[in-house]
Interface confidence: low
């Protein structure tokens, strides 16, 4: 006991009243107002609890302390007074701060600050979004990515810091009166071809495509270096000389020099100039029709085996050459005889008659045009003379069945001699290179010389054999009618065509004549 | 016959930079979009960049933008790839490839394997 | 990371049909034309169809391709030993600024 009557054993936060009791200090309380024992406590009171009388005031928090309290204001807000704490509502002074005043960087870029009652937010700019983990942080809204889909289907959408732009995709422009950017872009195909935005070589045709285009060879030529045709890039050569080249093991200077002329044309050929280079090479076919030189010393094989190469790269140059002519009929003629009749036409369903000096040609211009072939049809008749020498006592080939039957009855015919060449040598072409069986026959009327009276007159044509040379044939072709010295002739097919007068007596009617044409 | 040939590959630490070339032959270079598409090792391909005809049009992936610079020399038949601040993902075979707008990657170089390691 | 969805593996005897599944969504596949790329062994990818089922020359009408709404699949009849390979879809993405995405691969095994 305190000798001056005060317990010292009071708990904490407690005072004593005397030697025997203690008191809780303020803002403590115990079970009991008087403590009369040292195992009571002093319990610190929390005055900001709900059921307390303390009230703060407005726009303010109540903090409990130990043994007391004290009102601060709300974040947010801030006292005018500039008294941190207060006690109660009467000493409340809290007003709302304005942060977007005080600090204006608060949200950052693309963000404006908006005061609130005891706080801020942040409104982004367009094209802008709160970051769901920083809301205060504005971040670019990918309007390509987000589902929107703003822009028209013909372009393509290219986001942007703050916004994005609807493109025309590569190889589109915008539709006339369209912008190029804003979401109402829209977009159509560059048509590159005609807006001469294209990169084709001038060997190729420029195709458009959606979105691009193509260069595909002009008609005549072919893909270069193995590059694919209706490529960017395609480059084409013109495939008519590529093949025409001397015949292997032919030794003729003449020979020789003819096919330079023809390598140098080919050389220096342009589409333009198919005209001009067609006339080129029928006048040096002419002229070494006329004069041979050393081609009339070859053996005879190897000059059925000139001839036989000469008709068939003549009638691929032909063939390829005039697809690049304009529209028209063509007549050339030459010294030694040699006659071109030529006739390009967009497809017309009519038949079509070639006039020639020693012979005429009426076929059905659908057979020109191979289907899908976007180039003109053409249909061409040369007549060349001069060939007769070289094809002269050429061999005459009959199908088995017909040599069978004519070896029975007729012996001596074929075997008194070659069959004589009666008309010109001539040659008939189309744009359509498949002419193996015509859909309709073509009719061809050859004037020749006078027919031997009682020798049997044949309509042939040459057949190119598998070793480069070749020989007269019947097959497909049949004898309409004959005069003495014109004769009509019907075939399923084209190549190149002449009138044979064979060896032997005609009786009055043998059957066998009738087997042969 | 179209021919993409590549050459610039080889080991850098992370942090270095590595310049990828490819020559075109066989084609009209100055024609056609260029690209270069990579693939690390066991993985599949990755687009990385890609840049127009004329240089008109640039565009690359996310993972690579801001560090790696595509450029081409029409003149060369070359295309190139600048590959700076280079990190171990990089690592990786990459390819350049020919390509029409809009379309496919129609050829392809052999590869170029790239190597990021410290 | 890829766009377009792959299976792994497939695994057919020579001789068998097999299907690959590329499946996309409307900002690639959807709103382009797929393209497949064959990848042999240590060699680089190979453009095997494009336009969705047109073949490049030189690739054998074996291997075909469609494409139905946002999915793709090239098939591969009378598989060969040789036609072991990791097969990949490609696309144009119009999410992407000009991006060309790829799908995750598919090893084709021939047992």
């Known amino acids: 006991q305190d000798s001056r009557g005060c317990a010292r054993w009071c708990p904490q936060d407690s005072s004593c009243v005397n030697a025997t009791a203690c008191r809780c200090n303020p803002g403590f309380s115990s079970f009991s107002e008087i403590i009369t024992t040292p195992m009571e406590t002093c319990d610190d009171i929390n005055e900001c609890a709900t059921l307390s009388k303390v009230s703060c005031g407005k726009f303010s928090d109540c903090w409990n302390t130990e043994g007391s309290y004290d009102c601060v204001c709300s974040p947010g807000y801030e006292p005018v007074s500039g008294a941190k704490t207060f006690k109660n509502e009467s000493e409340n002074t809290c007003q709302d701060v304005d942060e977007c005043q005080q600090n204006p960087r608060l949200c950052k870029s693309y963000g404006t600050c908006v005061n609130t009652l005891g706080s801020y937010t942040c409104q982004c700019l367009p094209g802008f979004k709160l970051k769901p983990e920083d809301p205060k942080l504005c971040t670019d809204v990918n309007e390509c990515t987000s589902g929107q889909n703003p822009c028209h289907s013909s372009t393509h959408c290219l986001n942007n810091v703050g916004s994005y732009q609807c493109r025309c995709r590569p190889g589109w422009q915008p539709i006339p009166g369209s912008p190029n950017g804003p979401n109402n872009t829209v977009c159509e195909d560059v048509d590159e071809c005609s807006s001469g935005q294209h990169q084709c070589d001038s060997s190729t045709v420029c195709f458009n495509t959606v979105g691009s285009y193509s260069c595909r060879c002009r008609p005549g030529w072919k893909p270069r270096h193995g590059i694919p045709n209706n490529q960017k890039d395609t480059v084409c050569e013109d495939m008519t000389f590529s093949t025409w080249t001397p015949p292997p093991g032919v030794h003729s200077q003449t020979l020789s020099r003819f096919f330079d002329k023809v390598q140098d044309l080919g050389r220096d050929y342009k589409p333009g100039l198919a005209n001009n280079t067609i006339q080129s090479i029928l006048q040096a076919l002419d002229e070494l029709l006329e004069a041979p030189g050393d081609l009339e010393t070859l053996p005879r094989l190897q000059q059925h085996c000139v001839a036989s190469h000469l008709l068939d790269g003549l009638e691929d140059v032909l063939r390829g050459l005039s697809k690049n002519l304009s529209n028209g009929l063509l007549n050339f003629s030459y010294p030694a005889g040699t006659e071109l009749s030529l006739e390009v036409q967009k497809q017309v369903d009519r038949s079509v008659t070639l006039r020639q000096n020693q012979a005429v040609m009426q076929l059905d211009w659908n057979q020109a045009q191979k289907s899908g072939d976007p180039g003109p049809s053409v249909v061409g008749l040369v007549s060349i003379p001069g060939m007769g020498k070289l094809l002269a006592e050429a061999p005459l080939v009959l199908e088995p069945e017909k040599q069978m039957l004519l070896h029975e009855t007729h012996q001596g015919l074929l075997q008194d001699g070659s069959p004589i060449l009666l008309s010109d040598v001539i040659s008939a072409f189309l744009s359509n290179n498949d002419t193996q069986n015509l859909s309709s026959p073509v009719t061809f009327t050859f004037s020749h010389r006078s027919v031997i009276p009682r020798q049997k007159v044949l309509c042939v044509f040459w057949e190119h054999g598998q070793n480069g040379c070749g020989h007269w044939a019947t097959t497909g072709c049949s004898t309409i009618g004959t005069r003495d010295t014109s004769t009509i002739c019907r075939c399923t097919h084209l190549s190149s065509f002449a009138v044979l007068m064979a060896h032997y007596d005609v009786q009055e009617e043998d059957p066998v004549l009738t087997v042969i044409t | 016959e179209v021919q993409l040939v590549q050459s610039g590959g080889g080991l850098v630490k992370p942090g270095g930079s590595l310049r990828l070339s490819c020559v075109a032959s066989g084609f009209i270079f100055r024609s056609y979009s260029m690209n270069w598409v990579r693939q690390a090792p066991g993985k599949g391909l990755e687009w990385v960049s890609s840049?127009?005809?004329?240089?008109?049009?640039?565009y690359y992936a996310d993972s690579v933008k801001g560090r790696f610079t595509i450029s081409r020399d029409n003149a060369k038949n070359s295309l190139y790839l600048q590959m700076d601040s280079l990190r171990a993902e990089d690592t990786a075979v990459y390819y350049c490839?020919?390509?029409?707008?809009?379309?496919?990657?129609?050829?392809w170089g052999q590869g170029t394997l790239v190597t990021v390691s410290s | 990371q890829s766009v377009l969805t792959q299976p792994p593996s497939v695994f057919a005897a020579p001789g068998e049909k097999v299907t690959i599944s590329c499946s996309g969504s409307?900002?690639?596949?959807?709103?382009?034309?797929v393209s497949w790329y064959q990848q042999l062994p240590g060699t680089a990818p190979k453009l095997l169809i494009y336009d969705n089922n047109k073949r490049p020359s030189g690739i054998p009408d074996r291997f075909s391709g469609s494409k139905s709404g946002t999915s793709a699949t090239l098939g591969i009849t009378g598989l060969q030993t040789g036609d072991e390979a990791d097969y990949y879809c490609?696309?144009?993405?119009?999410?992407?600024?000009?991006?060309?995405?790829f799908g995750t691969g598919t090893k084709v095994t021939v047992l």
């Open positions: 490839a020919r390509r029409e707008y809009g379309g496919p990657f129609d050829y």
């Open positions: 409307s900002s690639n596949i959807g709103n382009d034309y």
């Open positions: 840049i127009s005809s004329s240089s008109s049009y640039i």
């Open positions: 490609g696309t144009w993405d119009s999410s992407l600024s000009a991006g060309y995405v």
